[in-house]
């Protein structure tokens, strides 16, 4: 906290410029008018102040705007944004995507800080939904952003926003999140032709149901093993050997290397060994020939 002292004669700042780096902290406090600072915040971002001097400038803004900064100031905070607490940021009303981008740029290359997380939360809540432009911006800065949202939060993502999603944005998503995103992606890409559709939908298939996988198996998609291994186990289990063979195409040979891992392991246990043998991969663990398979879940449904 800087002591309140009168500004020395002739030192009153008429504008925010480089000469202010030669002011002591108490002189900045006494000689820089907070309203002037607020209107010329963009200039602060061109002046090489020390961190201590910036603390004084922040203090002046805090005094001027105890209820929270206006967006005209927020947009030009630059480094000062990193000095804000989440409590400070909760007082803000940020509506402009340009403001959001400017602040995310300051933190670029760093992990998502509590300040950034709070800012994004305020921004998205203010907009009411995660629209395409916002999602585009957020995933450009933080590829893992989408997967940091809860399934409930993801439900507010409109299908049109899915076009902004890149495969790497979904790398850390769990099945519950993909369950929400997959139907949106299916809707977003529904008018694309077979091969183009598969390229776009591939990253979302961890949320696909059995019937959609069956449909894909009829389209010569040649799904790679990495994608297959991310499919829901419950969606893979009902697929026949012939369907999996069609789904994977030339990649079917990769099943051998994954036979001890889910979902391949569980799927093998559900297949007739005879059928598995037709693949010629030496997959073992299927239902021996001559055994009858009862689907107990179907039996329960009937009774």
């Amino acid at each position: 906290e800087v002591e309140k002292t009168a500004c020395p004669s002739g030192k009153k700042a008429r504008e925010i410029d480089e000469s202010l780096i030669f002011y002591k902290k108490w002189e900045l406090e006494a000689c820089v008018d907070a309203a002037l600072l607020a209107t010329q915040m963009d200039r602060v971002n061109a002046i090489p102040f020390t961190y201590e001097q910036l603390d004084v400038l922040k203090h002046k803004l805090d005094e001027l705007y105890p209820q929270g900064y206006p967006e005209s100031v927020i947009q030009h905070l630059g480094y000062l944004f990193l000095k804000m607490s989440p409590e400070d940021i909760r007082k803000w009303n940020v509506t402009s995507l340009e403001t959001l981008k400017a602040l995310l740029e300051v933190n670029k290359g760093h992990e998502m800080s509590p300040q950034v997380a709070t800012l994004i939360d305020r921004f998205v809540k203010g907009r009411g939904q995660l629209d395409k432009d916002t999602l585009d911006t957020l995933t450009a800065f933080y590829p893992g952003y989408l997967c940091s949202l809860s399934p409930e939060e993801l439900s507010s993502v409109p299908p049109s926003s899915i076009w902004a999603v890149r495969p790497q944005d979904l790398d850390t998503c769990d099945p519950r999140q993909l369950d929400v995103l997959y139907p949106k992606a299916r809707l977003a890409f529904q008018n694309m032709n077979g091969s183009e559709y598969f390229v776009k939908i591939q990253s979302f298939l961890g949320g696909a149901p059995t019937e959609d996988l069956k449909a894909l198996s009829q389209q010569n998609v040649s799904m790679d093993l990495a994608t297959f291994m991310k499919l829901r186990t419950d969606a893979v289990l009902p697929l026949t050997v012939a369907e999996v063979q069609k789904l994977l195409g030339p990649h079917v040979e990769g099943l051998k290397a994954e036979e001890r891992h889910r979902p391949v392991r569980d799927w093998i246990l559900r297949q007739r060994q005879d059928d598995l043998d037709t693949l010629g991969l030496g997959l073992q663990g299927g239902i021996p020939n001559g055994y009858l398979v009862l689907d107990l879940s179907m039996q329960e449904a009937l009774s």
């Epitope: 480089e18 602060v44 971002n45 061109a46 002046i47 090489p48 102040f49 020390t50 961190y51 910036l54 030009h76 905070l77 630059g78 480094y79 000062l80 944004f81 400017a102 740029e105 300051v106 670029k108």
Partner: nanobody
């Protein structure tokens, strides 16, 4: 973001030193740089500044005519040439920078002694 100062040392009053400020892990080219100093028991004070292009420089009254700030963007370095050093110039010298979007960096300092 980290800046690294070098070139400090012990020098006789009236002597000269050239301090350097370089970036660690990024390039200084689009950063405006300020030089500051802090004498024992005193507040840090501004010494000089230079714009990112090098076209604009400023100096504290106490060093005008003796210190010169410059930059070599090919070497990604900013310099502070200090001539006619006085005992009162004894301090730890720091550089601070500001770049695009208000990104900032500051160094740990280099010590200058002119007893």
């Amino acid at each position: 973001l980290q800046l690294v100062e070098s070139g400090g040392g012990l020098v006789q009053p009236g002597g000269s030193l050239r301090l350097s400020c370089a970036a660690s892990g990024f390039t200084l080219d689009n950063y405006a740089i300020g030089w500051f100093r802090q004498a024992p028991g005193k507040e840090r004070e501004g010494v000089s500044s230079i714009s990112s292009s090098g076209g604009s420089t400023n100096y504290a009254d106490s060093v005008k005519g003796r210190f010169t700030v410059s930059r070599d963007n090919a070497k990604h370095t900013v310099y502070l040439q200090m001539n006619s050093l006085k005992p009162e110039d004894t301090a730890v010298y720091y550089c601070a920078g500001v770049g695009d979007y208000g990104r900032r960096a500051m160094g740990q300092g280099t010590s200058v002694t002119a007893p």
